[in-house]
Interface confidence: low
């Protein structure tokens, strides 16, 4: 440890300003009071202070505050929110979805790190469910933060937040958590129109039962191949030949291309050949 | 690990001056505050001052402030204590230190 | 300047019993920070002072925890439980609050 303590004569910071990125570690330690910079906060971020001095701030507010933040000083963290770790979000309470945003908007562009998973969990926890407008926000920094649940957290989201979802935020999502999730997108569209209604539960699909995909296939809504290729083995195995050509419609020559992969082979393997025939595709069962 | 190597033990007479040096090892030496202290025989610890290596801004105490000098080579990691108009009070260990750092003292015997 | 008071200029000690050694200033060592910058050295027969504890409780690297230092604002305490031959030497407390950094006189622990 450095430790250079008294603060040079002059040197005493009167505020958060430019001048303070001249000063060495030690005399930030030294000149910088804790509670000047807890107020001060918002002006850090507009200063390129290096990486040793973040660190000194950091340790002054620590200091200050050592049982957590007030949320009004998470709030301006800045670029100092990235030397957080775990172990000190953990004591935060964060209620703002501003406050949130601000911290996300620093670690804009990176991999969901170990601090923003602590952060987006603590508030999470903090407002109780993930509502629409947290999972909006959420889902717009990291479209995959949806499939980073477990199908326990999954559980929580309430159907009307299912809005805020879009097709690419389920794309890592693996079957138990489509399980999840589906059941709820049917909740949240079950008053749209057969042809709306499809575009928004598509990306769900892969949590349907074969009931649902059976009642799709009666209305004419022409599933691609990507969106079939993704439903449960276990849904689709049940289907007639007659069901996946209705649910297909012009997209049904794409099975043959698909014909050793999953789940059209195990499908394939349970029909009879006369009614794969049917399709004229030359599918071998 | 940090090693403060200091110049070895010298005799002058009153009136001379002397320059004490030190010199650090394992520690950026910009990023360090060195510090003199100095123990006449018997005695208890006295700060001379320090210095910041880095800008060469250094501060002494009230006591020293017209018998010490304190200066830093960068380049060669080296700490200066120039101590002038040398009286029999000057006999003393003079150690250099940065925090938990100590030299092992240089000592100076001012005697005719 | 800050003057460093250490009442007791000897501490004699039987091995195996604790010691608390004491110190004083007559200004309060508390920064703005939360931290009491206030510092104990121990200084063996014939070496160079050696860091024991920096800011008031916390232990300097090496060092073991028999070594605890406590107190607030103006009064200090260096404990050493279950003393030690090797514990023998003079211990000196300093103020880093500000400049000039002043020390005290120094206590000498002696074994019985």
């Known amino acids: 440890e450095v430790e250079k303590t008294a603060c040079p004569s002059g040197k005493k910071a009167p505020e958060i300003d430019e001048s303070l990125i001249f000063y060495k570690k030690w005399e930030l330690e030294a000149c910088v009071d804790a509670a000047l910079l807890a107020t001060q906060m918002d002006r850090v971020n507009a200063i390129p202070f290096t990486y040793e001095q973040l660190d000194v701030l950091k340790h002054k507010l620590d200091e200050l505050y050592p049982q957590g933040y007030p949320e009004s000083v998470i709030q301006h963290l800045g670029y100092l929110f990235l030397k957080m770790s775990p172990e000190d979000i953990r004591k935060w309470n964060v209620t703002s979805l501003e406050t949130l945003k601000a911290l996300l908007e620093v670690n804009k562009g990176h991999e969901m790190s170990p601090q923003v998973a602590t952060l987006i969990d603590r508030f999470v926890k903090g407002r109780g469910q993930l509502d629409k407008d947290t999972l909006d926000t959420l889902t717009a920094f990291y479209p995959g933060y949806l499939c980073s649940l477990s199908p326990e957290e999954l559980s929580s989201v309430p159907p009307s937040s299912i809005w805020a979802v879009r097709p690419q935020d389920l794309d890592t999502c693996d079957p138990r958590q489509l399980d999840v999730l589906y059941p709820k997108a049917r909740l949240a569209f079950q008053n749209m129109n057969g042809s709306e209604y499809f575009v928004k539960i598509q990306s769900f699909l892969g949590g349907a039962p074969t009931e649902d995909l059976k009642a799709l296939s009666q209305q004419n809504v022409s599933m691609d191949l990507a969106t079939f290729m993704k439903l449960r083995t276990d849904a689709v195995l049940p289907l007639t030949v007659a069901e996946v050509q209705k649910l297909l419609g012009p997209h049904v020559e794409g099975l043959k291309a698909e014909e050793r992969h999953r789940p059209v082979r195990d499908w394939i393997l349970r029909q009879r050949q006369d009614d794969l025939d049917t399709l004229g595709l030359g599918l071998q069962g | 690990e940090v090693q403060l190597q200091q110049s070895g033990a010298d005799l002058v007479k009153p009136g001379a001056s002397v320059k004490l040096s030190c010199t650090v090892f394992g520690l950026n030496f910009k990023d360090t505050f060195m510090h003199w202290v100095r123990q006449r025989p018997e005695q208890g610890l006295e700060w001379i001052g320090r210095i910041d290596p880095a800008n060469d801004n250094s501060i002494y105490g009230p006591k020293f402030q017209d018998k010490a000098t304190i200066t830093a080579d960068t380049s060669s990691n080296t700490a200066y204590l120039h101590l002038s108009s040398l009286t029999s009070e000057d006999t003393a260990v003079y150690y250099c230190?940065?925090?938990?750092?100590w030299g092992h003292g240089t000592t100076l015997t001012v005697s005719s | 300047d800050i003057v460093m008071t250490q009442a007791a200029s000897s501490e004699p000690v039987t091995p195996g019993e604790s010691v608390s050694i004491s110190c004083r200033s007559d200004k309060s060592l508390l920064h703005s920070n939360g931290h009491n910058y206030l510092y104990w050295f121990l200084q063996r027969p014939g070496q160079s002072p050696h860091l024991l504890i920096y800011?008031?409780?916390n232990l300097a690297s090496g060092v073991p925890d028999r070594f605890s230092g406590s107190g607030s604002g103006t009064a200090f305490t260096l404990r050493i439980s279950r003393v030690e031959a090797e514990d023998v030497g003079v211990y000196y407390c300093?103020?880093?609050?500000?400049?000039?950094?002043?020390f005290g006189a120094g206590t000498k622990l002696e074994l019985k």
């Open positions: 230190l940065y925090f938990d750092n």
């Open positions: 300093m103020q880093h609050l500000e400049y000039p950094l002043t």
């Open positions: 800011r008031m409780s």
